[in-house]
Protein backbone atom coordinates (compact mmCIF):
# COMPACT_ATOMS: atom_id res chain seq x y z
CA UNK A 1 0.00 0.00 0.00
CA UNK A 2 1.71 3.58 -0.79
CA UNK A 3 1.28 6.20 1.35
CA UNK A 4 -0.35 9.68 -0.29
CA UNK A 5 3.31 11.44 -0.49
CA UNK A 6 4.46 8.28 -2.81
CA UNK A 7 1.26 8.09 -4.74
CA UNK A 8 1.59 11.54 -5.09
CA UNK A 9 4.53 11.75 -6.72
CA UNK A 10 3.42 9.35 -9.38
CA UNK A 11 0.77 11.57 -9.66
CA UNK A 12 3.18 14.41 -10.50
CA UNK A 13 5.42 12.31 -12.59
CA UNK A 14 2.63 11.25 -14.98
CA UNK A 15 1.63 14.70 -15.02
CA UNK A 16 5.21 16.09 -15.34
CA UNK A 17 5.48 13.42 -18.09
CA UNK A 18 2.40 14.60 -20.22
CA UNK A 19 3.08 18.71 -19.46
CA UNK A 20 6.84 19.06 -18.56
CA UNK A 21 5.22 20.59 -15.78
CA UNK A 22 7.11 20.14 -12.20
CA UNK A 23 6.09 20.25 -8.85
CA UNK A 24 7.34 23.84 -7.84
CA UNK A 25 6.26 25.20 -4.00
CA UNK A 26 3.14 24.43 -3.12
CA UNK A 27 3.49 26.60 0.11
CA UNK A 28 6.07 28.06 1.56
CA UNK A 29 8.32 26.24 3.90
CA UNK A 30 8.77 26.91 7.74
CA UNK A 31 10.36 30.62 8.49
CA UNK A 32 9.80 31.80 4.66
CA UNK A 33 6.74 34.27 4.41
CA UNK A 34 4.06 34.50 1.62
CA UNK A 35 4.27 37.64 -0.52
CA UNK A 36 1.87 36.44 -3.81
CA UNK A 37 3.04 34.09 -5.62
CA UNK A 38 6.47 34.05 -4.17
CA UNK A 39 8.08 33.11 -0.89
CA UNK A 40 10.42 35.60 0.62
CA UNK A 41 12.89 34.32 3.95
CA UNK A 42 14.74 37.89 5.35
CA UNK A 43 18.04 36.96 6.92
CA UNK A 44 18.46 37.87 10.42
CA UNK A 45 22.55 38.21 10.18
CA UNK A 46 24.55 39.98 7.66
CA UNK A 47 26.85 39.70 4.34
CA UNK A 48 28.52 41.49 1.72
CA UNK A 49 26.49 41.39 -1.41
CA UNK A 50 28.24 37.96 -3.30
CA UNK A 51 27.70 36.14 0.12
CA UNK A 52 24.36 36.98 0.27
CA UNK A 53 23.73 35.55 -3.50
CA UNK A 54 25.46 32.31 -2.04
CA UNK A 55 23.55 32.20 0.50
CA UNK A 56 20.00 32.40 -1.19
CA UNK A 57 22.00 29.83 -3.75
CA UNK A 58 22.72 27.47 -1.02
CA UNK A 59 19.07 27.77 -0.16
CA UNK A 60 17.70 26.76 -3.45
CA UNK A 61 16.40 29.99 -3.83
CA UNK A 62 17.50 33.59 -5.57
CA UNK A 63 18.29 36.99 -3.92
CA UNK A 64 14.92 38.81 -4.39
CA UNK A 65 13.92 39.93 -7.70
CA UNK A 66 11.01 42.78 -8.32
CA UNK A 67 9.08 43.12 -11.09
CA UNK A 68 7.73 46.36 -10.65
CA UNK A 69 6.72 49.62 -8.06
CA UNK A 70 3.94 47.48 -6.92
CA UNK A 71 5.83 44.48 -5.69
CA UNK A 72 8.62 46.75 -4.26
CA UNK A 73 5.98 48.13 -1.96
CA UNK A 74 4.68 45.20 -0.78
CA UNK A 75 8.04 43.72 0.12
CA UNK A 76 9.00 46.88 1.89
CA UNK A 77 5.58 46.26 4.06
CA UNK A 78 7.36 43.55 5.39
CA UNK A 79 10.25 45.16 6.46
CA UNK A 80 9.44 46.35 10.49
CA UNK A 81 12.40 49.10 10.88
CA UNK A 82 13.05 52.02 8.83
CA UNK A 83 16.76 52.03 9.72
CA UNK A 84 17.40 48.27 8.09
CA UNK A 85 18.73 47.65 4.81
CA UNK A 86 18.19 44.36 2.92
CA UNK A 87 20.52 43.31 -0.64
CA UNK A 88 18.21 42.24 -3.41
CA UNK A 89 19.49 40.38 -6.68
CA UNK A 90 20.43 43.63 -8.34
CA UNK A 91 23.83 45.21 -9.15
CA UNK A 92 26.03 47.27 -11.40
CA UNK A 93 27.32 45.97 -14.28
CA UNK A 94 30.51 47.91 -15.29
CA UNK A 95 30.78 46.06 -18.93
CA UNK A 96 27.37 47.13 -19.76
CA UNK A 97 26.99 50.48 -17.68
CA UNK A 98 23.61 49.36 -16.35
CA UNK A 99 21.99 48.07 -13.59
CA UNK A 100 21.28 44.51 -13.96
CA UNK A 101 19.32 41.69 -12.26
CA UNK A 102 20.74 38.29 -11.23
CA UNK A 103 19.22 36.61 -13.54
CA UNK A 104 20.71 38.72 -16.59
CA UNK A 105 17.70 41.01 -17.37
CA UNK A 106 18.30 45.10 -17.13
CA UNK A 107 16.28 47.83 -14.61
CA UNK A 108 13.94 49.50 -15.96
CA UNK A 109 14.81 52.68 -14.70
CA UNK A 110 10.79 53.50 -14.42
CA UNK A 111 10.57 50.72 -12.03
CA UNK A 112 12.60 51.82 -8.85
CA UNK A 113 14.07 55.04 -7.93
CA UNK A 114 17.66 54.63 -6.53
CA UNK A 115 19.26 56.65 -4.62
CA UNK A 116 23.35 56.80 -4.92
CA UNK A 117 25.92 56.20 -7.66
CA UNK A 118 25.81 53.86 -10.60
CA UNK A 119 29.33 53.06 -10.37
CA UNK A 120 31.52 49.72 -9.85
CA UNK A 121 31.10 47.94 -7.26
CA UNK A 122 27.58 48.96 -6.35
CA UNK A 123 25.03 47.02 -5.42
CA UNK A 124 21.24 47.54 -4.80
CA UNK A 125 19.59 47.25 -1.28
CA UNK A 126 15.80 48.09 0.13
CA UNK A 127 15.10 49.28 3.42
CA UNK A 128 11.27 50.27 4.56
CA UNK A 129 11.32 53.62 2.22
CA UNK A 130 13.80 53.77 -0.21
CA UNK A 131 15.96 51.71 -2.35
CA UNK A 132 19.63 52.71 -2.12
CA UNK A 133 22.84 52.01 -3.87
CA UNK A 134 25.57 50.56 -1.64
CA UNK A 135 29.17 49.13 -1.94
CA UNK A 136 28.65 45.79 -2.24
CA UNK A 137 30.92 44.63 0.40
CA UNK A 138 28.96 46.55 2.83
CA UNK A 139 27.52 44.11 5.42
CA UNK A 140 23.65 44.05 5.61
CA UNK A 141 20.58 41.87 5.80
CA UNK A 142 18.91 40.25 2.65
CA UNK A 143 16.48 38.65 1.16
CA UNK A 144 15.86 35.33 -0.76
CA UNK A 145 12.93 34.44 -2.77
CA UNK A 146 11.15 31.28 -3.78
CA UNK A 147 8.54 30.96 -6.49
CA UNK A 148 5.49 29.49 -4.95
CA UNK A 149 3.37 28.17 -7.67
CA UNK A 150 4.26 25.34 -10.10
CA UNK A 151 4.72 26.96 -13.60
CA UNK A 152 3.11 25.14 -16.72
CA UNK A 153 6.20 24.30 -19.02
CA UNK A 154 8.55 26.23 -17.16
CA UNK A 155 11.90 24.79 -19.06
CA UNK A 156 14.91 26.38 -18.01
CA UNK A 157 16.73 27.97 -20.73
CA UNK A 158 19.87 26.55 -22.35
CA UNK A 159 22.65 28.02 -19.35
CA UNK B 1 -14.03 16.84 -8.50
CA UNK B 2 -10.30 17.47 -7.77
CA UNK B 3 -7.25 16.81 -10.50
CA UNK B 4 -4.82 13.99 -9.31
CA UNK B 5 -2.35 17.16 -8.55
CA UNK B 6 -4.67 19.23 -6.92
CA UNK B 7 -5.52 16.34 -4.60
CA UNK B 8 -1.56 16.13 -4.09
CA UNK B 9 -1.21 19.47 -2.76
CA UNK B 10 -4.05 18.63 0.10
CA UNK B 11 -1.72 15.64 0.45
CA UNK B 12 1.45 17.18 0.82
CA UNK B 13 0.22 20.00 2.69
CA UNK B 14 -1.27 17.47 5.47
CA UNK B 15 1.82 16.06 5.48
CA UNK B 16 3.65 19.03 6.13
CA UNK B 17 1.65 20.15 8.52
CA UNK B 18 2.51 17.09 10.46
CA UNK B 19 6.04 16.89 10.33
CA UNK B 20 7.25 20.25 9.06
CA UNK B 21 8.32 18.71 5.52
CA UNK B 22 8.04 20.46 2.72
CA UNK B 23 7.32 18.43 -0.72
CA UNK B 24 10.83 19.22 -1.71
CA UNK B 25 11.68 18.36 -5.55
CA UNK B 26 10.11 14.83 -6.04
CA UNK B 27 12.01 13.76 -9.43
CA UNK B 28 14.44 16.03 -11.36
CA UNK B 29 13.40 18.79 -13.83
CA UNK B 30 13.17 18.40 -17.38
CA UNK B 31 16.67 18.61 -18.36
CA UNK B 32 18.45 17.97 -15.07
CA UNK B 33 20.27 14.79 -15.06
CA UNK B 34 19.73 13.08 -11.61
CA UNK B 35 23.06 11.57 -9.64
CA UNK B 36 21.51 9.95 -6.30
CA UNK B 37 20.19 12.27 -4.56
CA UNK B 38 20.94 15.46 -6.37
CA UNK B 39 19.27 16.66 -10.07
CA UNK B 40 22.26 18.54 -11.69
CA UNK B 41 22.42 21.04 -14.77
CA UNK B 42 25.16 20.76 -16.84
CA UNK B 43 25.68 24.32 -18.42
CA UNK B 44 26.05 24.67 -22.12
CA UNK B 45 27.21 28.51 -22.50
CA UNK B 46 29.83 29.86 -20.50
CA UNK B 47 29.83 32.63 -17.31
CA UNK B 48 32.67 33.90 -15.35
CA UNK B 49 32.18 31.78 -11.16
CA UNK B 50 30.03 34.87 -9.80
CA UNK B 51 27.62 34.73 -12.78
CA UNK B 52 27.38 30.85 -12.53
CA UNK B 53 27.06 31.44 -8.55
CA UNK B 54 23.84 33.85 -9.96
CA UNK B 55 22.27 31.43 -12.88
CA UNK B 56 22.18 29.07 -10.37
CA UNK B 57 20.63 30.99 -7.63
CA UNK B 58 17.72 32.48 -10.22
CA UNK B 59 17.09 28.37 -11.31
CA UNK B 60 16.63 27.77 -7.21
CA UNK B 61 20.01 25.52 -7.32
CA UNK B 62 23.37 26.14 -6.11
CA UNK B 63 26.49 25.88 -7.72
CA UNK B 64 27.41 21.77 -7.27
CA UNK B 65 28.81 21.21 -3.63
CA UNK B 66 30.85 18.03 -3.40
CA UNK B 67 30.58 16.06 -0.10
CA UNK B 68 33.34 13.38 -1.06
CA UNK B 69 35.96 12.24 -3.57
CA UNK B 70 33.29 9.51 -4.61
CA UNK B 71 30.76 12.08 -5.26
CA UNK B 72 33.16 13.71 -6.95
CA UNK B 73 33.95 11.12 -9.24
CA UNK B 74 30.19 10.05 -10.01
CA UNK B 75 29.83 13.51 -11.00
CA UNK B 76 33.28 13.37 -13.53
CA UNK B 77 31.82 10.64 -14.87
CA UNK B 78 28.93 12.43 -16.33
CA UNK B 79 31.03 14.98 -18.06
CA UNK B 80 31.53 13.78 -21.51
CA UNK B 81 34.52 15.90 -22.86
CA UNK B 82 37.73 16.06 -21.27
CA UNK B 83 38.52 19.16 -22.42
CA UNK B 84 35.75 21.08 -20.93
CA UNK B 85 35.67 22.74 -17.68
CA UNK B 86 32.95 23.17 -14.89
CA UNK B 87 32.46 25.52 -12.21
CA UNK B 88 31.42 24.42 -8.48
CA UNK B 89 30.82 26.23 -5.31
CA UNK B 90 34.08 26.29 -4.10
CA UNK B 91 36.09 29.52 -3.92
CA UNK B 92 39.43 31.11 -2.27
CA UNK B 93 38.52 32.87 1.07
CA UNK B 94 41.26 35.49 1.55
CA UNK B 95 40.13 36.53 4.70
CA UNK B 96 40.24 33.06 5.77
CA UNK B 97 42.93 32.16 3.78
CA UNK B 98 41.24 28.93 2.72
CA UNK B 99 38.91 26.74 0.05
CA UNK B 100 35.50 27.77 1.50
CA UNK B 101 32.33 26.14 -0.33
CA UNK B 102 29.48 28.87 -0.47
CA UNK B 103 27.00 27.09 2.07
CA UNK B 104 30.23 28.62 4.32
CA UNK B 105 31.92 25.06 5.16
CA UNK B 106 35.74 24.96 4.56
CA UNK B 107 37.06 22.50 2.37
CA UNK B 108 38.50 19.06 3.73
CA UNK B 109 42.11 18.97 2.22
CA UNK B 110 41.53 15.28 1.73
CA UNK B 111 38.26 16.03 -0.48
CA UNK B 112 39.75 17.20 -3.56
CA UNK B 113 43.51 17.32 -5.02
CA UNK B 114 43.70 20.92 -6.42
CA UNK B 115 45.62 21.60 -9.25
CA UNK B 116 46.88 25.29 -9.28
CA UNK B 117 47.22 28.05 -6.72
CA UNK B 118 45.13 28.53 -3.78
CA UNK B 119 45.29 32.91 -3.94
CA UNK B 120 43.03 35.53 -3.98
CA UNK B 121 40.57 35.81 -7.27
CA UNK B 122 40.76 31.82 -7.49
CA UNK B 123 37.35 29.49 -8.00
CA UNK B 124 37.29 25.78 -8.40
CA UNK B 125 36.40 23.92 -11.55
CA UNK B 126 36.14 20.27 -12.22
CA UNK B 127 36.77 18.24 -15.92
CA UNK B 128 36.25 14.50 -16.65
CA UNK B 129 40.15 13.73 -14.86
CA UNK B 130 40.83 16.73 -12.61
CA UNK B 131 40.01 19.93 -10.17
CA UNK B 132 41.33 23.02 -10.96
CA UNK B 133 42.17 26.40 -9.86
CA UNK B 134 41.16 28.89 -11.98
CA UNK B 135 40.79 32.70 -12.32
CA UNK B 136 37.27 33.76 -11.03
CA UNK B 137 37.02 35.64 -14.10
CA UNK B 138 37.68 33.12 -16.47
CA UNK B 139 34.53 32.02 -18.78
CA UNK B 140 33.62 28.15 -18.14
CA UNK B 141 30.46 26.25 -18.15
CA UNK B 142 29.11 25.28 -14.27
CA UNK B 143 27.08 23.06 -12.54
CA UNK B 144 24.25 23.53 -10.67
CA UNK B 145 22.55 21.24 -7.98
CA UNK B 146 18.96 21.04 -6.42
CA UNK B 147 18.62 18.50 -3.68
CA UNK B 148 15.94 15.78 -5.07
CA UNK B 149 14.65 14.10 -1.80
CA UNK B 150 12.20 15.93 0.73
CA UNK B 151 13.97 16.14 3.73
CA UNK B 152 12.64 15.78 6.76
CA UNK B 153 12.46 18.60 8.86
CA UNK B 154 14.54 20.83 6.99
CA UNK B 155 14.70 24.05 8.55
CA UNK B 156 17.23 26.64 7.31
CA UNK B 157 19.44 28.00 9.82
CA UNK B 158 18.69 31.67 10.62
CA UNK B 159 20.19 33.38 7.83
CA UNK C 1 22.88 42.70 30.08
CA UNK C 2 23.50 44.02 26.80
CA UNK C 3 26.44 46.20 27.41
CA UNK C 4 30.38 47.76 26.01
CA UNK C 5 33.14 48.20 28.24
CA UNK C 6 36.56 49.73 27.38
CA UNK C 7 39.96 49.67 29.32
CA UNK C 8 43.39 49.97 28.34
CA UNK C 9 43.39 53.70 28.99
CA UNK C 10 46.01 55.92 30.88
CA UNK C 11 48.66 58.57 30.70
CA UNK C 12 51.17 58.18 27.93
CA UNK C 13 53.58 60.32 26.73
CA UNK C 14 54.12 62.03 23.02
CA UNK C 15 55.18 59.34 21.04
CA UNK C 16 54.35 55.94 22.67
CA UNK C 17 51.84 53.49 22.41
CA UNK C 18 48.62 52.34 23.86
CA UNK C 19 45.65 49.36 23.26
CA UNK C 20 42.15 50.24 24.14
CA UNK C 21 40.24 46.76 24.43
CA UNK C 22 36.30 46.69 24.24
CA UNK C 23 34.07 43.41 25.94
CA UNK C 24 30.74 43.00 24.50
CA UNK C 25 28.06 41.01 25.74
CA UNK C 26 24.73 40.28 26.24
CA UNK C 27 24.26 40.47 21.73
CA UNK C 28 25.51 38.59 18.45
CA UNK C 29 29.01 40.63 18.52
CA UNK C 30 29.43 39.14 15.10
CA UNK C 31 26.58 40.88 13.15
CA UNK C 32 27.39 44.29 13.83
CA UNK C 33 29.49 47.18 12.42
CA UNK C 34 31.18 48.44 15.63
CA UNK C 35 33.28 51.86 15.99
CA UNK C 36 35.52 54.00 18.51
CA UNK C 37 34.22 57.58 18.76
CA UNK C 38 36.38 59.87 21.17
CA UNK C 39 35.75 62.84 22.87
CA UNK C 40 38.47 65.56 24.08
CA UNK C 41 38.04 67.27 27.16
CA UNK C 42 35.41 70.20 26.84
CA UNK C 43 35.10 69.55 23.23
CA UNK C 44 32.54 67.95 20.87
CA UNK C 45 32.59 64.07 19.28
CA UNK C 46 34.67 63.06 16.86
CA UNK C 47 34.72 59.52 14.89
CA UNK C 48 37.65 57.56 14.83
CA UNK C 49 37.45 54.54 13.14
CA UNK C 50 34.86 51.13 12.15
CA UNK C 51 35.09 47.77 10.84
CA UNK C 52 32.87 45.86 9.57
CA UNK C 53 31.26 42.77 11.40
CA UNK C 54 33.30 40.42 9.45
CA UNK C 55 36.58 42.93 9.73
CA UNK C 56 37.16 42.58 6.07
CA UNK C 57 36.34 46.43 5.98
CA UNK C 58 37.79 49.37 8.03
CA UNK C 59 37.75 53.13 7.78
CA UNK C 60 39.39 55.68 9.41
CA UNK C 61 39.27 59.76 10.46
CA UNK C 62 41.95 61.15 8.52
CA UNK C 63 43.35 62.62 11.44
CA UNK C 64 44.33 58.95 12.59
CA UNK C 65 45.29 57.59 9.29
CA UNK C 66 48.38 55.58 9.95
CA UNK C 67 48.11 55.90 13.29
CA UNK C 68 45.89 53.69 14.39
CA UNK C 69 44.34 50.17 13.83
CA UNK C 70 41.15 48.69 14.92
CA UNK C 71 40.63 45.09 14.92
CA UNK C 72 38.15 42.74 16.28
CA UNK C 73 38.04 39.05 17.40
CA UNK C 74 34.24 37.72 17.12
CA UNK C 75 35.09 34.59 18.98
CA UNK C 76 36.15 36.76 22.07
CA UNK C 77 33.42 39.38 21.33
CA UNK C 78 36.13 42.19 21.58
CA UNK C 79 36.80 45.48 19.76
CA UNK C 80 40.77 46.63 19.63
CA UNK C 81 41.95 50.05 18.66
CA UNK C 82 45.86 49.82 18.73
CA UNK C 83 47.22 52.95 19.23
CA UNK C 84 50.95 54.08 17.91
CA UNK C 85 52.56 57.90 17.82
CA UNK C 86 50.37 59.20 20.04
CA UNK C 87 50.00 63.39 19.99
CA UNK C 88 49.13 65.27 22.86
CA UNK C 89 45.93 66.06 20.71
CA UNK C 90 44.60 62.72 21.06
CA UNK C 91 43.86 63.31 24.69
CA UNK C 92 40.51 62.19 25.09
CA UNK C 93 37.34 59.62 26.46
CA UNK C 94 37.58 56.84 23.61
CA UNK C 95 34.03 55.17 23.23
CA UNK C 96 33.74 51.86 21.89
CA UNK C 97 30.32 52.14 19.89
CA UNK C 98 28.24 49.36 17.92
CA UNK C 99 25.91 50.71 14.64
CA UNK C 100 22.20 50.15 14.68
CA UNK C 101 21.54 46.70 13.11
CA UNK C 102 21.98 45.90 9.50
CA UNK C 103 21.87 49.55 8.72
CA UNK C 104 25.54 48.68 7.03
CA UNK C 105 28.14 51.71 6.87
CA UNK C 106 25.53 54.20 8.03
CA UNK C 107 26.37 54.22 10.84
CA UNK C 108 23.73 55.16 14.05
CA UNK C 109 25.48 54.42 17.35
CA UNK C 110 22.83 52.78 19.07
CA UNK C 111 24.80 51.28 21.95
CA UNK C 112 28.02 52.85 23.56
CA UNK C 113 30.69 51.96 26.37
CA UNK C 114 31.00 54.19 29.49
CA UNK C 115 34.63 55.44 27.66
CA UNK C 116 37.94 55.28 28.83
CA UNK C 117 40.29 58.15 29.16
CA UNK C 118 43.54 58.46 27.57
CA UNK C 119 45.56 61.20 28.54
CA UNK C 120 48.96 61.92 26.28
CA UNK C 121 51.26 64.35 27.91
CA UNK C 122 55.13 64.72 28.80
CA UNK D 1 34.04 66.14 3.97
CA UNK D 2 30.35 67.15 5.14
CA UNK D 3 30.30 69.71 7.63
CA UNK D 4 27.72 70.01 10.33
CA UNK D 5 26.06 73.57 11.81
CA UNK D 6 24.10 73.33 14.64
CA UNK D 7 22.47 75.94 16.31
CA UNK D 8 21.85 77.58 18.24
CA UNK D 9 25.12 76.39 20.24
CA UNK D 10 23.33 76.55 23.55
CA UNK D 11 19.31 77.43 24.62
CA UNK D 12 18.00 78.35 28.06
CA UNK D 13 14.40 77.04 28.66
CA UNK D 14 12.16 76.02 31.23
CA UNK D 15 10.18 72.91 31.90
CA UNK D 16 7.09 72.45 29.65
CA UNK D 17 8.86 74.69 27.00
CA UNK D 18 8.93 73.47 23.34
CA UNK D 19 12.98 73.60 22.33
CA UNK D 20 13.76 72.94 18.40
CA UNK D 21 17.33 72.49 17.58
CA UNK D 22 18.49 72.88 14.15
CA UNK D 23 21.31 70.71 12.03
CA UNK D 24 22.33 72.38 8.62
CA UNK D 25 24.43 69.73 6.24
CA UNK D 26 27.21 71.40 3.99
CA UNK D 27 26.04 69.15 1.55
CA UNK D 28 22.60 66.91 0.68
CA UNK D 29 22.74 63.63 2.87
CA UNK D 30 19.19 62.35 1.92
CA UNK D 31 18.34 61.18 5.52
CA UNK D 32 20.93 59.97 6.64
CA UNK D 33 21.09 62.09 9.87
CA UNK D 34 20.82 60.98 14.11
CA UNK D 35 20.42 63.15 17.04
CA UNK D 36 22.04 61.94 20.43
CA UNK D 37 21.88 63.72 23.74
CA UNK D 38 24.68 63.74 26.00
CA UNK D 39 24.87 64.27 30.26
CA UNK D 40 28.26 65.25 31.80
CA UNK D 41 29.98 62.44 32.33
CA UNK D 42 28.35 60.14 30.28
CA UNK D 43 28.20 58.28 27.26
CA UNK D 44 25.80 59.98 24.44
CA UNK D 45 22.78 58.12 23.94
CA UNK D 46 20.84 57.53 20.60
CA UNK D 47 17.50 59.27 20.57
CA UNK D 48 16.76 60.02 16.63
CA UNK D 49 17.78 57.90 13.34
CA UNK D 50 17.21 57.79 9.86
CA UNK D 51 15.60 61.38 10.22
CA UNK D 52 12.87 60.83 12.11
CA UNK D 53 13.05 57.57 13.14
CA UNK D 54 12.59 57.25 17.06
CA UNK D 55 14.66 54.66 18.93
CA UNK D 56 13.36 52.37 21.12
CA UNK D 57 12.63 53.54 24.77
CA UNK D 58 13.06 57.29 23.96
CA UNK D 59 10.24 59.53 25.14
CA UNK D 60 7.67 60.71 22.53
CA UNK D 61 8.44 64.12 23.20
CA UNK D 62 11.36 64.08 21.14
CA UNK D 63 10.92 63.90 17.10
CA UNK D 64 13.07 64.61 14.13
CA UNK D 65 12.23 66.03 10.86
CA UNK D 66 13.80 67.12 7.48
CA UNK D 67 15.89 65.46 4.97
CA UNK D 68 18.55 66.68 2.35
CA UNK D 69 20.66 69.70 4.13
CA UNK D 70 18.07 71.04 6.92
CA UNK D 71 17.37 68.74 9.67
CA UNK D 72 15.57 69.60 12.89
CA UNK D 73 15.34 67.78 16.79
CA UNK D 74 12.41 69.48 18.44
CA UNK D 75 11.39 68.53 22.38
CA UNK D 76 7.86 69.41 22.54
CA UNK D 77 7.67 69.95 26.61
CA UNK D 78 10.61 69.63 28.02
CA UNK D 79 11.46 67.79 31.17
CA UNK D 80 14.29 68.06 33.84
CA UNK D 81 15.84 65.12 32.96
CA UNK D 82 16.49 66.78 29.24
CA UNK D 83 18.68 68.80 30.26
CA UNK D 84 22.03 68.15 28.45
CA UNK D 85 24.27 68.53 25.33
CA UNK D 86 22.68 67.59 22.17
CA UNK D 87 24.53 66.11 18.68
CA UNK D 88 23.35 65.51 15.56
CA UNK D 89 26.00 63.25 13.12
CA UNK D 90 25.75 62.64 9.52
CA UNK D 91 25.73 58.86 8.72
CA UNK D 92 26.33 58.71 4.91
CA UNK D 93 27.63 55.44 3.18
CA UNK D 94 31.08 56.95 3.30
CA UNK D 95 33.18 58.08 6.12
CA UNK D 96 33.99 60.33 8.29
CA UNK D 97 30.90 60.35 10.34
CA UNK D 98 30.95 64.04 11.70
CA UNK D 99 28.52 65.19 14.34
CA UNK D 100 27.66 69.05 14.69
CA UNK D 101 29.16 70.98 17.16
CA UNK D 102 26.55 70.39 19.87
CA UNK D 103 23.95 72.50 21.66
CA UNK D 104 23.99 72.35 24.98
CA UNK D 105 19.91 73.16 26.32
CA UNK D 106 20.00 75.05 29.65
CA UNK D 107 17.72 75.65 32.78
CA UNK D 108 16.74 79.19 32.16
Known amino acids: QKSSIEKCSVDIQQSRNKTTERPGLLNCPIYWQQLREKCLLFSHTVNPWNNSLADCSTKESSLLLIRDKDELIHTQNLIRDKAILFWIGLNFSLSEKNWKWINGSFLNSNDLEIRGDAKENSCISISQTSVYSEYCSTEIRWICQKELTPVRNKVYPDS | QKSSIEKCSVDIQQSRNKTTERPGLLNCPIYWQQLREKCLLFSHTVNPWNNSLADCSTKESSLLLIRDKDELIHTQNLIRDKAILFWIGLNFSLSEKNWKWINGSFLNSNDLEIRGDAKENSCISISQTSVYSEYCSTEIRWICQKELTPVRNKVYPDS | QVQLVESGGGLVKPGGSLRLSCAASGFTFSDYYMSWIRQAPGKGLEWVSY????????YYADSVKGRFTISRDNAKNSLYLQMNSLRAEDTAVYYCARSLMSTGTHLYFDLWGRGTLVTVSS | DIQLTQSPSSVSASVGDRVTITCRAS??????LAWYQQKPGKAPKLLIYAASSLQSGVPSRFSGSGSGTDFTLTISSLQPEDFATYYCQQVTSVPPYTFGGGTKVEIK
Open chain 4, 27 to 32: QGISSW
Open chain 3, 51 to 58: ISPSGATI
